[in-house]
C-alpha cells in the first residue's frame, strides 16, 4: 500500500500555497509594470541569455543535484522547481520594494528578473540540506523567510557598506549554507531504524545528480558574472570562473582517489567538488589578474571540498542530521568562507602595499559585512527551523523521511524504484 | 570623433512630459554605460541617471526616480532620457556623457574605474507656465 | 547617499601659483571611484582625474589627485590662466553617483 499524503496536509497544501499565489498576483496588480522604454531586440535577448543561464543552473542543476537519494529523487527535482518558482516571484516584489518602492509602483525589468532568480537560488542551496524532512507547506516558509532575510541583508550591506550588486549578492554562499545547516539543526535529527536505506544515494539518482553538477558546472562563469556592470568585469569574471572551476575538476577527481584507501573515486566527492572553484573565486572573480591565481583558488578550492567531503559529513550527520549525500551546505559553508578571504586578502594586500590606514578601515568594512551576513543567516535560519517545528505544517514522520511515496502517486506501487 | 549631440530640450510646463535624446557617434556605443547629468542655472552639476552597456540595468537620483525614465537602442546608439510629471525645479541644461570603464593591475588584482570621460554640449529645458 | 563638500567654494589665486582644491565624503569612498572634472563658462565638464590619481587622457601634469578613504585632494602646481574654471568632484558607490558642489577657481 502507499504512503498517502497525511489527510490534513492535503488540505493545508493547496490552500496555504494558492492562497500565497493569489496574494502574490494581487500585489503584482497593484505595485508593478513593466520597463516600457525602448530597447533594441539585440540587446534584450543578450540580457535573457544571462537570465536563462541562471535559471537553467536553478532548475536543471541544483535540482538535478540534490536528487541522488534512492527513495527522494523525485521530490528533489519537483519541489525544488516549485520552490524556484515561488522564490523568483516573492524576490522580484520584495527587491522592488525595498529599491524602489517610494518612487511608486516596482518596475520590472530582465535584470530584476536575473537577480530574483539569484535570491531563489540562495534557498536551493539551503534547502538541500533539509529536503526529504519537510514537506512542501514547510518548504513555503522556508522560501519566504529565506528570500526576505537575504533581500534585507542585500539592502543593509548596499546602503551602509556602500557595495555594488554583484558584492553583496556573493555573500549568497555563505549565506545560504549557514542559513540550511541552522534550519536542519532544528528540525528532528535521528532516523528511525529501518529507514537508513532510503537516505542513501542509488546508481540512477547519482547518475542525475552528476547531471546536475555538469549544468552547473558550465554555467557558473554566467551566475558569478551576472551582476557585473561593464564587459571587461563581466569578461575577466567568466575567464576566471571557467579556469577556476576547471582545476577544481582535476583536483576534485584526483583527490577523491586520493582520499580512498583502494584509490576509489566518489560520486558524492565529485558531485561537490567539481562547483568548488566557482564559489570560492566568486565574490573576487572579476578582480583577479591572471589565470594562474585563479587556478590556484580552483585547487585550494577542490583540495578543502574533497577534504570536507570526507571528514565532516560524519560531524553534520550527527549534529544537523543531515545525510551524507547532502554536501552543499557544510561545502558552501567552507567554499563560501574561503572565497570571501580570499576578497579580504585582497584587501590586506592592498593595505600592506599602500600603507594607508584607510584601505585597512575597508578590510574591517569586509569583515563586518561577512560577520552579518553569517550572523543573519544564523537568525533567520533557526528562527525557520523553530517555524518548520510547528505542529500546524504536519510535517513528515520521522518514519516517511527521504520517501518519494509520501508526496507523489506511482501507479505501480513499487516499493525500491 | 567621439561625439554626444543631445536633443530635445525647449520649455515645457509643469506636469507636462518631455523626452530627451542624445546621439552618439565615433565609438562603439553598446560597450559603454551612459548617463544623464544636469546643471541648473548658475548651480552645480547633478547626477540624474545610468544606464549600463546592455540596457539591463538603471539607476536614478531619488530626486527623479519615478518620474524620469533613462534607455538607450544600441542599433540606432542613442540614449533616451523621457521626463514626466516635469516640476519647476528640474530647468536645467541635461548633459549625455559617456561613461569610460577601464583598469588598472597589480600582481594580485585589478582595480576597475568609472568615470564619464566624454560630454555633449547640453540640452536646455525651462519648465515655467 | 554619500555627501561630498569642497573646500573652499570660491578660492581667488594667480597665475604661477600653487592651487589645492579639497573633497571630503560623508563616508569611505574607494578611490577607484573618486574623480574630478573642470568646468568653464557655458561649456560641458571635462574629466581632470580619475581614481583619485590617475590623470585622464590629454591632461597636463601640472594636475594631480591624491587621497583616500573621506579626505581628497586635488593639486594645480602652477596655475595657467586656462585653469581658471569651476572645479568638481565626484564619487561613485553602490550604483549611485554624487558630486561635490564645485570650488571656483578665480584670478585674483
Known amino acids: 500500500m502507499s504512503s498517502k499524503y497525511p489527510r490534513s496536509v492535503r488540505r493545508c497544501l493547496p490552500l496555504w500555497a494558492l492562497t500565497l499565489e493569489a496574494a502574490l498576483i494581487l500585489l503584482f496588480y497593484f505595485f508593478t509594470h513593466y520597463d516600457a522604454s525602448l530597447e533594441d531586440q539585440k540587446g534584450l535577448v543578450a540580457s535573457y541569455q544571462v537570465g536563462q543561464d541562471l535559471t537553467v543552473m536553478a532548475a536543471i542543476g541544483l535540482g538535478f543535484l540534490t536528487s541522488s537519494f534512492r527513495r527522494h529523487s523525485w521530490s528533489s527535482v519537483a519541489f525544488n522547481l516549485f520552490m524556484l518558482a515561488l522564490g523568483v516571484q516573492w524576490a522580484i516584489l520584495l527587491d522592488g520594494f525595498l529599491s524602489q518602492f517610494p518612487s511608486g509602483k516596482v518596475v520590472i525589468t530582465l535584470f530584476s528578473i536575473r537577480l530574483a532568480t539569484m535570491s531563489a537560488l540562495s534557498v536551493l542551496i539551503s534547502v538541500d540540506a533539509v529536503l526529504g524532512k519537510v514537506n512542501l507547506a514547510q518548504l513555503v516558509v522556508m522560501v519566504l523567510v529565506e528570500v526576505t532575510a537575504l533581500g534585507n541583508l542585500r539592502m543593509v550591506i548596499s546602503n551602509i557598506f556602500n557595495t555594488d550588486y554583484h558584492m553583496n549578492m556573493m555573500h549568497i554562499y555563505v549565506f545560504a549554507a549557514y542559513f540550511g545547516l541552522s534550519v536542519a539543526w532544528c528540525l528532528p535529527k535521528p532516523l528511525p531504524e529501518g529507514t537508513e536505506d532510503k537516505d542513501q544515494t542509488a546508481t540512477i539518482p547519482s547518475l542525475s545528480a552528476m547531471l546536475g553538477a555538469l549544468f552547473l558546472w558550465m554555467f557558473w562563469p554566467s551566475f558569478n558574472s551576472a551582476l557585473l556592470r561593464s564587459p571587461i568585469e563581466r569578461k575577466n569574471a567568466v575567464f576566471n570562473t571557467y579556469y577556476a572551476v576547471a582545476v577544481s575538476v582535476v583536483t576534485a577527481i584526483s583527490g577523491s582517489s586520493l582520499a580512498h584507501p583502494q584509490g576509489k573515486i566518489s560520486k558524492t566527492y565529485v558531485h561537490s567538488a567539481v562547483l568548488a572553484g566557482g564559489v570560492a573565486v566568486g565574490t573576487s572573480c572579476h578582480l583577479i589578474p591572471s589565470p594562474w591565481l585563479a587556478m590556484v583558488l580552483g585547487l585550494v578550492a577542490g583540495l578543502i571540498s574533497v577534504g570536507g567531503a570526507k571528514y565532516l559529513p560524519g560531524c553534520c550527520n550527527r549534529v544537523l542530521g543531515i545525510p551524507h549525500s547532502s554536501i552543499m551546505g557544510y561545502n558552501f559553508s567552507l567554499l563560501g568562507l574561503l572565497g570571501e578571504i580570499i576578497y579580504i586578502v585582497l584587501l590586506v594586500l592592498d593595505t600592506v602595499g599602500a600603507g594607508n590606514g584607510m584601505i585597512g578601515f575597508q578590510v574591517l568594512l569586509s569583515i563586518g559585512e561577512l560577520s552579518l551576513a553569517i550572523v543573519i543567516a544564523l537568525m533567520s535560519g533557526l528562527l525557520t527551523g523553530l517555524l518548520l517545528n510547528l505542529k500546524i505544517w504536519k510535517a513528515p514522520h520521522e518514519a516517511k523521511y527521504f520517501d518519494d511515496q509520501v508526496f507523489w502517486k506511482f501507479p505501480h506501487l513499487a516499493v525500491g524504484f | 570623433e567621439v561625439q554626444l549631440v543631445e536633443s530635445g530640450g525647449g520649455v515645457v510646463q509643469p506636469g507636462r512630459s518631455l523626452r530627451l535624446s542624445c546621439a552618439a557617434s565615433g565609438f562603439t556605443f553598446s560597450n559603454h554605460g551612459m548617463h544623464w547629468v544636469r546643471q541648473a542655472p548658475g548651480k552645480g552639476l547633478e547626477w540624474v541617471a545610468v544606464?549600463?552597456?546592455?540596457?539591463?540595468?538603471?539607476y536614478y537620483a531619488d530626486s527623479v526616480k519615478g518620474r524620469f525614465t533613462i534607455s538607450r537602442d544600441n542599433s540606432k546608439n542613442t540614449l533616451y532620457l523621457q521626463m514626466n510629471s516635469l516640476r519647476a525645479e528640474d530647468t536645467a541644461v541635461y548633459y549625455c556623457?559617456?561613461?569610460?570603464?577601464?583598469?588598472?593591475?597589480?600582481?594580485?588584482?585589478?582595480?576597475?574605474?568609472?568615470?564619464?570621460?566624454?560630454w555633449g554640449k547640453g540640452t536646455t529645458v525651462t519648465v515655467s507656465s | 547617499e554619500i555627501v561630498l563638500t569642497q573646500s573652499p567654494g570660491t578660492l581667488s589665486l594667480s597665475p604661477g601659483e600653487r592651487a589645492t582644491l579639497s573633497c571630503r565624503a560623508s563616508q569611505s569612498v574607494s578611490s577607484s571611484y573618486l574623480a574630478w572634472y573642470q568646468q568653464k563658462p557655458g561649456q560641458a565638464p571635462r574629466l581632470l582625474i580619475y581614481?583619485?590619481?590617475s590623470r585622464a587622457t590629454g591632461i597636463p601634469d601640472r594636475f594631480s589627485g591624491s587621497g583616500s578613504g573621506t579626505d581628497f585632494t586635488l593639486t594645480i602646481s602652477r596655475l595657467e590662466p586656462e585653469d581658471f574654471a569651476v572645479y568638481y568632484c565626484q564619487q561613485y558607490g553602490s550604483s549611485r553617483y554624487t558630486f561635490g558642489q564645485g570650488t571656483k577657481l578665480e584670478i585674483k
Open positions: 544606464i549600463w552597456y546592455d540596457g539591463s540595468n538603471k
Open positions: 581614481g583619485a590619481s
Open positions: 556623457a559617456r561613461e569610460m570603464a577601464s583598469y588598472s593591475s597589480s600582481w594580485y588584482r585589478r582595480y576597475y574605474y568609472y568615470v564619464m570621460d566624454v
